[in-house]
């Protein structure tokens, strides 16, 4: 019988708003009061097993006590009503859970999308956390027809996919209702034609066809999504070369209505391009489709668009009446080769004499020429045709080169080694830049490049290393042959020397010492040596530092103390810092030469 509760709490299952006030009443049953000899004065209220102060209780009558909470801040409160029985023992009467939270906010930013082939999905911003189970219902209707409600799932409470087929060209009204135990609110209604919310499927079966007639075009074809039968489509077509990471885009106005092919123009010959395409409703209302799968194609070959860079070297040891000439040229970059290079054609014509033809697969040709003047031409050939000819005059043996470039400078900038000069007054056909690494250990192996006759500033297009000394030579080339070369040294990036100078004494006197050293080998300089510093000290004295110009290889220390041990070392400095050489010791004599104690 006593398993029957001794009383009850009202309300039974309260849900209250956070930070609001709440009053609960515990009512004791007569039979319980009689059994335990108690009344409402004996009631003890507890929350989460902690006793509530008596000041919060109100005795309503002999059977009922209430407790009031102000500003409820907990989401879940276990409230129990207990009575103090014989010997101050607590007996539980009843317990409830006070659940607190917030009413729903009005849903905002309601928007819908119709992914082609799927049903309409709408999403919204549900507002703040309510801490209560809040149900969101998407409602929709035509002017003449109500559709079934779409109840958002618990795991995706701010979106819902309707269960009915989308009908285009008929306006639909859509809104969201949010409801929990504390209230119900409705979003603003939105009214739209679903055709303006379409996200089409991407075009598929994209393929690329090249043209033998035009090496600058590729034709794209694709299959449109089915929705083309309902709406007019517009497209974005993007393309890039195979190795590029950024996309170029066809002007949108060229693809502003439904089509299933497009010819892309102004492309580079014999280049692989990657394409992708997407579509949307032509008036821009709705959503872009995802991008199609990429498709690639190669433009057809065209004849090489440029003659190769062309130069020569003459073997200094030449036989009487003949000289060995090495003709050299550069491979055209793909964007100028415009196809697979098959071979090179060289012609050599002795001045006003007969012509010799050579077909070469390499990028050099060594020939024995007489001491006369020669005219050399070079063309490069691919499947489609030949390039224009590069022409080079190899002057006679007694030719005197003149008219060098002036004010030659070389300097690093933006991780490149730049060369600039003042152009000669004479008309220059082209410039040849040659460079090599100066080293004490290896010969200077030359690389070269050609620049147009209008150029007076360029950078070296080789694989340059830091802290190496480059000897750069610029030769202007005129119609009748090369001008005088001019040279300059430069570094891509300097570093401190790898070694410091080794200092030694040349002569030591009572009060002075002549120090000498060797210039640092170029391989350890790592930059231009700007100056030296000599550091010297006695065992007990302070160190003295003397700066010495980098052109010197000896220096005299004066005002030294006689009969004293000196420690000396030397540092060499580039623009990027210095490096000390080994320490060297010497002792000044007690007496000068011929001096007696």
């Amino acid at each position: 019988e006593l398993l029957d509760p001794c009383g009850y709490i009202s309300p039974e299952s309260p849900v209250v708003q956070l930070h609001s006030n709440f009053t609960a009443v515990c009512v004791l049953k007569e039979k319980c009061m009689d059994y335990f000899h108690v009344n409402a004065n004996y009631i003890v209220w507890k929350t989460n097993h902690f006793t509530i102060p008596k000041e919060q209780y109100t005795i309503i009558n002999r059977t009922a006590s209430s407790v009031t909470f102000t500003d409820i801040a907990s989401l879940n409160i276990q409230l129990t009503c207990n009575i103090l029985t014989f010997g101050q023992l607590e007996q539980n009467v009843y317990g409830i859970t006070i659940i607190s939270g917030l009413p729903p906010e009005k849903p905002k930013n309601l928007s819908c999308i119709v992914n082609e082939g799927k049903k309409m999905r709408c999403e919204w911003d549900g507002g703040r956390e309510t801490h209560l189970e809040t149900n969101f219902t998407l409602k929709s209707e035509w002017a003449t027809h109500k559709f079934a409600d779409c109840k958002a799932k618990r795991d995706t409470p701010t979106s819902c996919t309707v269960d009915y087929s989308t009908v285009y060209f008929v306006n639909i009204e859509v809104w969201v209702e949010a409801e929990n135990a504390l209230g119900k609110v409705t979003s603003d209604h939105i009214n739209f034609d679903p055709v303006y919310k379409v996200k089409p499927n991407p075009p598929h079966n994209l393929s690329v066809i090249n043209s033998e007639e035009l090496s600058s075009i590729l034709k794209l074809t694709w299959t449109n999504p089915s929705i083309k039968s309902v709406i007019i489509l517009k497209y974005n077509i993007q393309y890039r070369t195979k190795d590029a990471s950024t996309w170029s885009q066809i002007p949108p106005e060229d693809t502003a209505s439904t089509r299933s092919s497009f010819t892309v123009q102004d492309l580079k010959p014999f280049t692989e391009y990657v394409f992708r395409i997407r579509c949307m409703k032509e008036d821009g209302k709705g959503y872009w489709s995802d991008w199609s799968e990429e498709a690639s194609g190669i433009t057809y070959e065209d004849r090489p668009s440029k003659a190769p860079s062309f130069w020569y070297k003459i073997d200094p040891s030449h036989t009487q009446g003949y000289r060995t000439v090495q003709l050299v040229w550069k491979t055209l970059p793909p964007f100028e080769a415009n196809g697979k290079i098959l071979d090179y054609e060289v012609t050599l014509t002795r001045w006003k004499s007969h012509l010799q033809n050579y077909t070469v697969n390499a990028t050099k040709l060594t020939v024995n020429l007489t001491n006369d003047r020669y005219l050399a031409t070079l063309t490069v050939r691919n499947l489609v045709g030949k390039s224009d000819a590069a022409v080079l005059t190899i002057p006679a043996c007694d030719f005197q080169a003149t008219h060098p470039v002036m004010d030659l400078k070389a300097f690093p900038k933006d991780n490149m080694l730049w060369v600039e000069w003042t152009t000669p007054r004479e008309s220059v056909k082209k410039y040849i830049l040659e460079w090599c690494v100066l080293s004490d250990k290896a010969p200077c192996i030359t690389d070269w490049q050609q620049e147009d006759g209008t150029v007076h500033r360029t950078y070296l297009r080789g694989n340059l290393a830091e802290s190496k000394c480059y000897l750069i030579t610029v030769t202007p080339v005129y119609a009748d042959g090369p001008g005088s070369p001019e040279s300059i040294k430069a570094y891509l990036k300097q570093a401190p020397p790898s070694k410091g100078p080794t200092v030694r004494t040349k002569k030591v006197g009572k009060n002075e010492a002549v120090l000498e050293w060797d210039q640092l080998p170029v391989d350890v300089q790592n930059g231009f040596i700007r100056n030296y510093t000599i550091f010297y000290r006695t065992i007990i004295g302070n160190e003295t530092a003397v700066n010495v110009d980098s052109s010197h290889t000896e220096y005299t220390l004066s005002s030294l103390t006689s009969d004293t041990l000196y420690m000396v070392r030397m540092a060499a400095y580039t623009d990027e810092g210095g490096k000390d050489g080994p320490e060297f010791t010497f002792t000044t004599p007690k007496f000068a030469q011929g001096e007696i104690e």
């Epitope: 082609e116 082939g117 009908v167 008929v170 089915s226 039968s229 309902v230």
Partner: antibody, heavy 128, light 108 residues
Framework: QVQLQESGPGLVKPSETLSLTCTVS????????WTWIRQPPGKGLEWIGH???????NYNPSLKSRVTISVDTSKNQFSLKLTSVTAADTAVYYC??????????????????????WGQGTTVTVSS | DIQMTQSPSSLSASVGDRVTITCRAS??????LNWYQQKPGKAPKLLIY???SLQSGVPSRFSGSGSGTDFTLTISSLQPEDFATYYC??????????FGQGTRLEIK
């Protein structure tokens, strides 16, 4: 109450062009497809094609090469032209209204509504 | 083209009878089928659209059902004015729209 009225010659010579006009009264031409349907004597209904108020057309593939449907919104009229007619084109020609509404089912599309307003029909005989 | 086949081609019934006409599509047309009634010398009249939606002003004794390929028009209690020819029509948006060959409903 929207009403449709077909008009045009009742007799057309073979190889000539059949031209009919449908006048829409009592309502707007906007927001509908305007349809032509024909019914040869003693036979069933054949859809010829339709046009929207914006001028988008759809034709029966079997007649496409010979049919043109056009709309004149200022006159609240739409027209049918059928070229190179033969005796097989003899029929009652109806114009009808089809409310806009295309239902999407996966990637298939259907006219949601039916042709809800029809003209009374005009008989066209092709004969020399 | 989607072919529509109605059965029966004709049938005789009496006033008060329950009548069923069926229509079969050669491929699935979801629920996009319309029913029309045509009386001699008159234009067709829309009864049912989207397989089961009753057109405004049409008596409730007419009803439609079905989806996919098989559809039914039912007249629950035949009235004298219901004797006519009935056509089904599929409304697939890719041309052409096609009609069934018709079912002639006669008085027994």
């Amino acid at each position: 109450q929207v009403q449709l009225q077909e008009s045009g010659p009742g007799l057309v010579k073979p190889s000539e062009t059949l031209s009919l006009t449908c006048t829409v009264s009592g309502g707007s031409i906007s927001n509908y497809y305007w349809t032509w349907i024909r019914q040869p004597p003693g036979k069933g209904l054949e859809w010829i094609g339709h046009i929207s108020n914006s001028g988008t057309t759809n034709y029966n593939p079997s007649l496409k090469s010979r049919v043109t449907i056009s709309v004149d919104t200022s006159k609240n009229q739409f027209s049918l032209k059928l070229t190179s007619v033969t005796a097989a084109d003899t029929a009652v020609y109806y114009c009808a209204r089809l409310p806009l509404g295309i239902a999407a089912v996966d990637t298939d599309y259907y006219y949601y509504f039916g042709m809800d307003v029809w003209g009374q029909g005009t008989t066209v005989t092709v004969s020399s | 083209d989607i072919q529509m086949t109605q059965s029966p081609s004709s049938l005789s019934a009496s006033v008060g009878d329950r009548v069923t006409i069926t229509c079969r599509a050669s491929q699935s047309i979801s629920s996009y089928l319309n029913w029309y009634q045509q009386k001699p010398g008159k234009a067709p009249k829309l009864l049912i659209y989207a397989a089961s939606s009753l057109q405004s002003g049409v008596p409730s004794r007419f009803s439609g059902s079905g989806s996919g390929t098989d559809f039914t028009l039912t007249i629950s209690s035949l009235q004298p004015e219901d004797f006519a020819t009935y056509y089904c029509q599929q409304s697939y948006s890719t041309p052409p729209i096609t009609f069934g060959q018709g079912t002639r409903l006669e008085i027994k």
